[in-house]
């Protein structure tokens, strides 16, 4: 149905404040409520750390935000500005692992969530500004891609590394600022509903005014959206060594991070394929909606709820195809 | 969010040439080994060929070998299929996914073994 055709459905406003406030009582639920349904949208982040314990070493991170059940995990690399790139390593529930060199070790931490860790020598490994992608797939709904790299501020010259600060800020403003804008209009559009609630409707059937009915298909997506927001983040962990720079990244200072959100215009409808297993709220997108204010810096989890893995027993090669190793 | 769009099927006699295309959106292309595969009526989805992230390597299913080539244009972001000396045996729809399936076993496969896929498009040899 178009939106022009449920226009007139509203009265026009009364003049005087009486009228002006039934209009915006009228308008600003549906204005709410279309906030709360697409609050939920699929996400992929991805977080790319770079290890100040560890030679040149990579952690990214990447994980998906959505209702669906994850099918497949495919992690990529490549070079900047377009250049080709190759697969790492793709993960399937029930298939199993493969990875292929320089990664050395791919494992679910979560039912959303993985971690890669590459080899920190050798030609073919990352350098700073290697660009990571993660693909979550989720059938049939759809898939979802996201990429990250090291900001440029990373590259080996530099006498000791930025801190995370000012990423991690800027990244967090935004999950704080839309998370909070939702929040908060979803919360106001319950207590409109409530507020309708007590208001006396003369001549009608008390059947056809009850606000249980609106109140439970506002608050619907709101708690559909606030759970896609409990997913916690996938993580591929990478370590690397740039292979065309004869310097080691510095040691010493904090590791940082690189968020890249990308947002997805479809939300997948599918119930989680680990549904019984507990979420564990962990990421700092998380503690908003759980009103944990004081761990909006805290890192992602590195264990999860223990999920049963499937790799192939004859190793990571054991399965390699005809196009052999990538 | 991910689209793979196929293209180029249609109605062809044997021996006749379609060429299948697969126009990706929404992922770094170029990053990804691209596969077709194809599903007949009555049958299971069947691995066709696979061709890996730069176009240096592809491979065939023996069914399809000297009649069947797979390319892609990382620049144009889309992935075809040649396909000459058709036959009624190769009657499907035809699927554009992202993934190489011998990464897990081509035995029972399903479209969810891959990252990505398309809607398909039919291809049908007959006279």
């Known amino acids: 149905m178009r939106t022009e055709a449920q226009v007139p459905a509203l009265q026009p406003p009364e003049p005087g404040l009486e009228g002006a406030m039934g209009h915006r009582t009228l308008v600003l639920p549906w204005v709410l409520l279309t906030l709360c349904v697409t609050a939920g949208t699929p996400e992929v982040w991805v977080q790319v750390r770079m290890e100040a314990t560890e030679l040149s070493s990579f952690t990214i991170r990447c994980g998906f935000l959505g209702s669906g059940s994850i099918s497949l995990v495919t992690v990529s690399w490549g070079g900047p500005n377009g250049a080709g790139g190759t697969t790492l390593a793709v993960l399937h529930p029930e298939r199993g692992i493969r990875q292929w060199a320089p990664a050395r070790q791919a494992r679910w931490e979560t039912q959303s969530s993985i971690s890669l860790i590459l080899e920190g020598s050798g030609a073919s490994s990352p350098c700073a500004n290697t660009t990571f992608c993660c693909k979550f797939a989720s059938f049939p709904e759809g898939s979802w891609e996201a990429c990250g790299s090291l900001p440029p501020s990373s590259d080996p010259g530099l006498s000791a590394p930025p801190t995370p600060a000012p990423i991690l800020r800027a990244d967090l403003a935004g999950i704080l600022g839309v998370s909070g804008v939702l929040l908060f209009g979803c919360v106001y559009l319950l207590h409109l509903l409530r507020r309708h609630k007590h208001r006396p409707a003369p001549r009608l059937q008390p059947s056809r005014t009850s606000p249980q009915a609106p109140r439970a298909r506002a608050w619907a997506p709101s708690q559909a959206s606030q759970a896609a927001l409990h997913v916690p983040y996938a993580t591929i962990n990478t370590s690397c060594r740039p292979a065309t720079l004869d310097t080691a990244h510095p040691h010493g200072g904090p590791s940082w991070w690189a968020s890249l959100p990308t947002h997805a215009a479809h939300r997948p409808q599918g119930p989680a394929a680990w549904a019984s297993t507990p979420i564990p709220a962990r990421g700092s997108f998380v503690s908003v909606e759980n009103g944990l204010y004081a761990q909006a810096g805290e890192r992602p989890p590195h264990t999860g709820p223990g999920l049963t893995l499937f790799p192939d027993p004859r190793g990571p090669r054991a399965m390699e195809g005809p196009l052999g190793v990538r | 969010e991910v689209q793979l769009v196929e293209s180029g099927g249609g109605l062809v006699q044997p021996g006749g040439s379609l060429r299948l295309s697969c126009a990706a959106s929404?992922?770094?292309?170029?990053?990804?080994?691209m596969s077709w595969v194809r599903q007949a009526p009555g049958k299971g989805l069947e691995w066709v060929s696979t061709i890996n992230s730069n176009g240096g390597r592809t491979s065939y299913v023996d069914s399809v070998k000297g009649r069947f080539t797979i390319s892609r244009d990382n620049t144009k972001n889309t992935l075809y299929l040649q396909m000459n000396s058709l036959k009624p045996e190769d009657t499907a729809v035809y699927y554009c996914?992202?993934?190489?399936?011998?990464?897990?076993?081509?035995?029972?496969?399903?479209?969810?073994?891959?990252?990505?896929w398309g809607q398909g498009t039919q291809v049908t040899v007959s006279s």
């Open positions: 996914v992202e993934g190489d399936p011998h990464n897990f076993g081509l035995e029972n496969l399903s479209l969810r073994d891959f990252g990505s």
């Open positions: 929404g992922f770094t292309f170029s990053y990804y080994d």
